[in-house]
């Protein structure tokens, strides 16, 4: 068919330290040489459908699916994945081919499937189908550990169903708060699956293999701590085990602990108690509430009560599917060159997220900190005052989240100039975006005060480099100014910067920086 465009489909694999801008991007990163995916016309299909060769991707790899369209005129497009339409921004390469890209950041199971690209050109409409799957999904997994009670013993077993077999360790800490950080001297690690000492302040179990390390904390209510303003909240998915530990210390043994769910005592078999005397002869009691596989009706307020301590509760919420709750609206910030500033994202998520911060194709490690109100926060301060677009990307087993930030650094303009036989152009990246003036230097105006208004064309935010806006001004050359020196000046609230250009006949142009 003569009307059909020439289409090329390619796969770009990005190196591990590459990262990208989330779901879709019109500016994919340059990386390894693109792999041709064929893109043959699919026979016996209604409408024009091209099918790319199947794509197999490693878990956590980042790729770009790219389509190059050799067709005259403009094109418009739409990506569809799992019945959701995704933004699509075509642009044109140096050979004037339409380029459409889909960036998949850190491949997960949820991103595998069929990606459909609908393209509309002036001549025709057509569809391109990509099938993306994860390579060797079953070979490597790392699952978050969970707890089980050891048969006929007051002990917990830590289990992580991972491949290759993970190393399991208990991470124990007996002090409060900050001093329970991973590398603190207060932290004791035990590389074993079974734990008998269940009276500690902070108990976590971690599993690690080639894919990394995942940890689960034993959710604890400590009745000796003052009741928190915010009720602690625990999320679980249907089918997961529930474990909550209630702990209390008293001067003697004359107290007991009880668990209730929504004011009804827990059934026998859903709790067990342990007690011991501490070094100073006080009595420590712990009472575990557990459900081996939770259902929706296990949701509610779990209250631990004691005759000698104030009662405390936790809200347990059972969900069908994991989630990430946060506001995804983009945020713009404007700071001074030496101002201290951090981006931050506040979110509530279950299971715990994995996240990255990305700027200018580079990925940065992402730390998250739990807040008292059940939310977590991730901050990024390592921007080195570079203006541009910063991306926070988070995902867990069931959900993905991307948030864009723009950082503008207030500074006076710096001007670069270039010229051709017919025009002179000046560029500046100062912020706020500068305004322009052109002046002619002549015998009548040796200080270059004679303003030029004819033939000036200003373009604001002409090109966007990782979110950094560049402003330009072009002067079309006329006989009246040929052979003269002209001065372009960019100014904003922080200052002015100028560049002087000699408009002589074609040839090399001297520029004089003039601040």
């Amino acid at each position: 068919n003569q009307d059909l465009p020439v289409i090329k489909c390619v796969l770009i694999n990005h190196k591990n330290n590459d990262s990208s801008v989330g779901k879709s991007s019109s500016y994919p990163m340059v990386s390894e040489s693109p792999e041709d995916l064929g893109c043959a016309l699919r026979p016996q299909s209604s409408g024009t459908v091209y099918e790319a060769a199947a794509v197999e991707v490693d878990v956590s790899a980042s790729i770009t699916l790219q389509v190059l369209v050799d067709a005259p005129g403009n094109i418009s497009c739409l990506w569809v994945f799992k019945h959701s339409s995704l933004n699509c921004q075509p642009h044109f390469d140096l050979q004037n081919r339409g380029v459409v890209s889909m960036v998949i950041l850190k491949m997960t199971e949820t991103q595998a499937g069929e990606y459909l690209l609908f393209i509309q050109s002036e001549a025709t409409n057509y569809t391109i189908l990509f099938t993306v799957s994860i390579r060797n999904t079953l070979l490597y997994t790392l699952r978050r550990p969970y707890f089980r009670k050891m048969e006929n013993q007051d002990a917990l077993v830590c289990i992580s169903e991972s491949v290759p077999e993970p190393i399991v360790e208990w991470v124990l800490c007996d002090s409060q708060g900050e001093s329970c950080k991973e590398e603190s001297p207060a932290v004791v690690k035990k590389e074993e699956k079974v734990l008998h000492e269940l009276f500690g302040t902070d108990i976590r179990c971690c599993a690690r293999n080639e894919l990394g390390r995942e940890c689960t904390r034993l959710f604890t209510i400590d009745l000796n701590q003052t009741p928190q303003t915010t009720l602690p909240q625990l999320f679980l998915k249907v089918g997961e085990p529930l474990w909550i530990r209630c702990k209390a210390v008293h001067v003697n043994h004359g107290f007991g602990l009880t668990w209730e769910l929504e004011n009804k005592a827990l059934e026998e078999g859903n709790y067990f108690e342990m007690s011991t005397y501490s070094t100073n002869r006080t009595m420590i009691r712990i009472l575990f509430a557990f459900v081996s596989s939770v259902a929706r009706n296990d949701t509610g307020y779990y209250t631990c009560s004691s005759s000698k301590h104030p009662s405390q509760s936790a809200l347990v919420t059972i969900v069908e599917k994991g989630f990430i709750n946060a506001t995804n609206s983009s945020e713009d910030y404007e700071i001074d060159q030496y101002e201290e500033f951090c981006f931050s994202v506040r979110f509530k998520a279950y299971p715990q997220i994995r996240c990255t911060w990305t700027f200018s194709r580079k990925s940065f490690p992402c730390e998250q900190k739990g807040l008292d109100n059940g939310y977590s926060i991730s901050k990024f301060c390592n921007h080195k005052h570079q203006p541009g677009e910063y991306i926070f990307h988070a995902e867990n087993d069931d959900a993905q989240f991307t948030k864009m930030f723009t950082l503008n650094i207030r500074r006076k303009p710096q001007v670069l100039a270039e010229a051709s036989a017919s025009q002179a152009s000046c560029f500046s990246d100062g912020y706020p975006l500068p305004s322009w003036t052109w002046k002619k230097c002549s015998d009548k105006s040796p200080n270059c005060t004679e303003e030029i208004t004819e033939g000036v064309w200003n373009r604001k935010a002409n090109r966007k480099v990782f979110g950094q806006w560049v402003s330009s001004s072009t002067l079309n050359m006329s006989e009246a100014i040929k052979g003269f020196l002209v001065k372009c000046c960019a100014y904003n609230s922080l200052g002015t910067s100028c560049e002087t250009i000699l408009l002589n006949s074609p040839g090399p142009f001297p520029f004089i920086q003039d601040n």
Epitope: N263, Y301, T303, S305, S307, P310, S311, L315
Partner: nanobody, 111 residues
């Protein structure tokens, strides 16, 4: 819809007394424990006292011996009797049942 309403706050001189009430609707009071909290200007909200379902009471160290918490299940109301008030007791006082909070009542103790 659970609603809690505090009342009884006001201006009192140091050494004086006040009795705060917390009335509840939409929740069966008798089966829950109730906490009183307070928040002084520019400070974090802090726990003051608790009364359990079986009328056991617990107090923060700062109010022990001066404040007394009680409940009237028939009226769905909890009380906080505050004696020997000090200027540092000045705060907005809130009652709480599980995740539910009242709007608060202002207590000001002048010296």
């Amino acid at each position: 819809q659970v609603q809690l309403q505090e009342s009884g706050g006001g201006l009192v001189q140091a050494g004086g007394s006040l009795r705060l009430s917390c009335a509840a609707s939409g929740v069966t009071f008798s089966i829950n424990y109730i906490d009183w909290y307070r928040q002084a200007p520019g400070k974090q909200r802090e726990w003051v006292a608790q009364i359990t379902r079986d009328s056991n009471s617990f107090y923060a160290d700062s109010v022990k011996g001066r404040f007394a918490i009680s409940r009237d299940n028939a009226k769905n109301t909890v009380y906080l009797q505050m004696n020997s008030l000090k200027p540092e007791d000045t705060a907005v006082y809130y009652c709480r049942v599980l995740s539910y909070w009242g709007q608060g009542t202002q207590v000001t103790v002048s010296s």
